[in-house]
């Protein structure tokens, strides 16, 4: 089924309204903000989650050097336009008719313009680098144990196919998780790396999106892994287009 039948809730998305009004009285859940039906057996798209969030009441070195084309989400929250499949529309505009182009994870990849701005296609983010710093521990984590635990987390909690977790790097106290997923690699039903990264980011911040599930208790050989800083870099299949002014 798409949602928990007994009490009609969405296990993978608490930002939903559910009722037994689906076919045959089945539980059907709709995302807050957009009212779109969601599949509760998998992760909800980041676009619908952001929309729901905006509608909710306000309350040698082994580490990777991000490419010069890597994007960081500096713009923060906005109320996005999502397509009928729940993906970000390539062009996003605010209420004051300021528009910009985004990638598949909803991060701005061009300078801001007006309503005449054209965004020909939704450019796919194919490489995500999650950069974490953990709190002090009694000693460094064993790299292979850490690697195994993070891969297990993405496989079991976020249902991301293991082949999309490209690497886990560790140089105390920094952990880097590389997610890679080209358009050609992503099959129907595969969780998108952007959605998995967003769920992970919210878990790390103690803002789990899962219904009724406890917060993320990440442990490596019994020892708690507590993250105190997160940075996420996004690399697109086509490099972003910013003016030189922004780069100086």
């Amino acid at each position: 089924h798409t949602a928990a039948q007994d009490n009609c809730t969405c296990p993978t998305n608490k930002m939903t309204v559910c009722s037994p009004d689906g076919p045959g009285g089945r539980c059907q859940c709709r995302a807050l903000g957009s009212g779109m039906a969601v599949d509760c057996s998998t992760l909800t798209s980041k676009c619908l989650l952001l929309k729901a969030r905006m509608s909710a009441p306000k309350n040698a070195r082994t580490l990777v050097r991000p490419s010069e084309h890597a994007l960081v989400d500096n713009d923060g929250l906005y109320d996005p336009d999502c397509d009928p499949e729940g993906r970000f529309k390539a062009r996003q505009c605010n209420q004051t008719s300021v528009c910009w182009c985004v990638n598949s994870v909803g991060v701005r990849r061009t300078d801001k313009g007006d309503l005449s701005l054209r965004c020909d296609e939704l450019v796919r983010t194919h490489h995500i680098l999650i950069d974490l710093r953990h709190r002090p521990t009694a000693g460094a984590f064993n790299h292979s144990d850490l690697d195994a635990e993070l891969r297990r987390l993405f496989r079991e909690r976020y249902r991301l196919h293991p082949k999309f977790v490209a690497a886990v790097h560790y140089e105390q106290p920094t952990i880097q998780i590389e997610l890679r997923q080209n358009t050609s690699q992503k099959a129907a039903g595969d969780v998108d790396i952007g959605d998995a990264a967003y769920y992970f980011e919210r878990d790390i911040k103690g803002e789990s999106l899962f219904q009724g599930r406890g917060g993320l208790d990440l442990r490596v050989r019994g020892e708690p892994l507590q993250v105190e800083r997160t940075l996420i870099y996004y690399l697109d299949e086509i490099p972003p287009k910013f003016s030189m002014k922004r780069l100086t």
């Epitope: 002090p136 521990t137 009694a138 000693g139 106290p173 020892e223 708690p224 507590q226």
Partner: antibody, heavy 123, light 109 residues
Framework: AVTLDESGGGLQTPGGALSLVCKGS????????MGWVRQAPGKGLEYVAA???????GYGAAVKGRATISRDTGQSTVRLQLNNLRAEDTATYYC?????????????????WGHGTEVIVSS | ALALTQPSSVSANPGETVEITCSGG????????YGWYQQKAPGSAPVTVI????KRPSNIPSRFSGSTSGSTNTLTITGVQADDEAVYYC?????????FGAGTTLTVL
């Protein structure tokens, strides 16, 4: 509300052994590091020992080699065993809870304290 | 072994702002960690006013705050009250063991 109740203090003999127990309630015991801090009469606070939620341990220099800290998640207790007691172990022993699970940065993370149990080592 | 440095005493009139500094904590890859503990009388249980540099337990008034600049942490009491008179200990991280400062006596005049 978080409560930490210590027991096991009292008059002890030099060279003997001491076992202090702290029972925690009002929080998910298994998720947090726990520890012991002591204060000798007229002196300041001194770190004794700590144990993470994953049971890694740390000890202060004055008790290293003589102390063992352990936890029982089922009973929500943390125990401090201190052997080969000396007069300088005379102090009020406080049970302390960390705001986190890890133990290494323990002292800066204490968010709750017990009322303390007095230990006097004297012949 | 590391040693934490904090002033032995500070004094203030009611309503004034008091700052108590603590330095000398352990460096964990460029980050320093401190906590502040209030003890109103010797032998009475300490009370945490700030932990993990800036976090304040829910039962502590908002006039208590903590801030870090470099390797020094500052406990600030804005609008000090007579009830705040106590000894304030700072605590920090030192690899596998914890350390405390010698304590600062706050006198409210």
């Amino acid at each position: 509300a978080v409560t930490l109740d210590e027991s096991g203090g009292g008059l002890q003999t030099p060279g003997g052994a001491l076992s202090l127990v702290c029972k925690g309630s009002g929080f998910t015991f298994s998720s947090y590091a726990m520890g012991w801090v002591r204060q000798a009469p007229g002196k300041g606070l001194e770190y004794v020992a700590a144990i993470s939620s994953g049971s890694s341990t740390g000890y202060g220099a004055a008790v290293k080699g003589r102390a063992t800290i352990s936890r029982d998640t089922g009973q929500s207790t943390v125990r401090l065993q201190l052997n080969n007691l000396r007069a300088e172990d005379t102090a009020t022993y406080y049970c302390a809870k960390s705001g986190y699970g890890g133990s290494a940065s323990y002292v800066s993370d204490i968010d709750a304290w017990g009322h303390g149990t007095e230990v006097i080592v004297s012949s | 072994a590391l040693a934490l440095t904090q002033p032995s005493s500070v004094s203030a009139n009611p309503g004034e702002t008091v700052e108590i500094t603590c330095s000398g904590g352990g460096d964990y890859y460029g980050t320093y960690y401190y906590g502040w503990y209030q003890q109103k009388a010797p032998g009475s249980a300490p009370v945490t006013v700030i932990y993990d540099n800036t976090k304040r337990p829910s039962n502590i008034p908002s006039r208590f705050s903590g801030s870090t600049s470099g390797s020094t942490n500052t406990l600030t009491i804005t609008g000090v009250q007579a009830d705040d008179e106590a000894v304030y200990y700072c605590g920090s991280y030192d690899s596998s063991a914890g350390i405390f400062g010698a304590g600062t006596t706050l006198t409210v005049l």
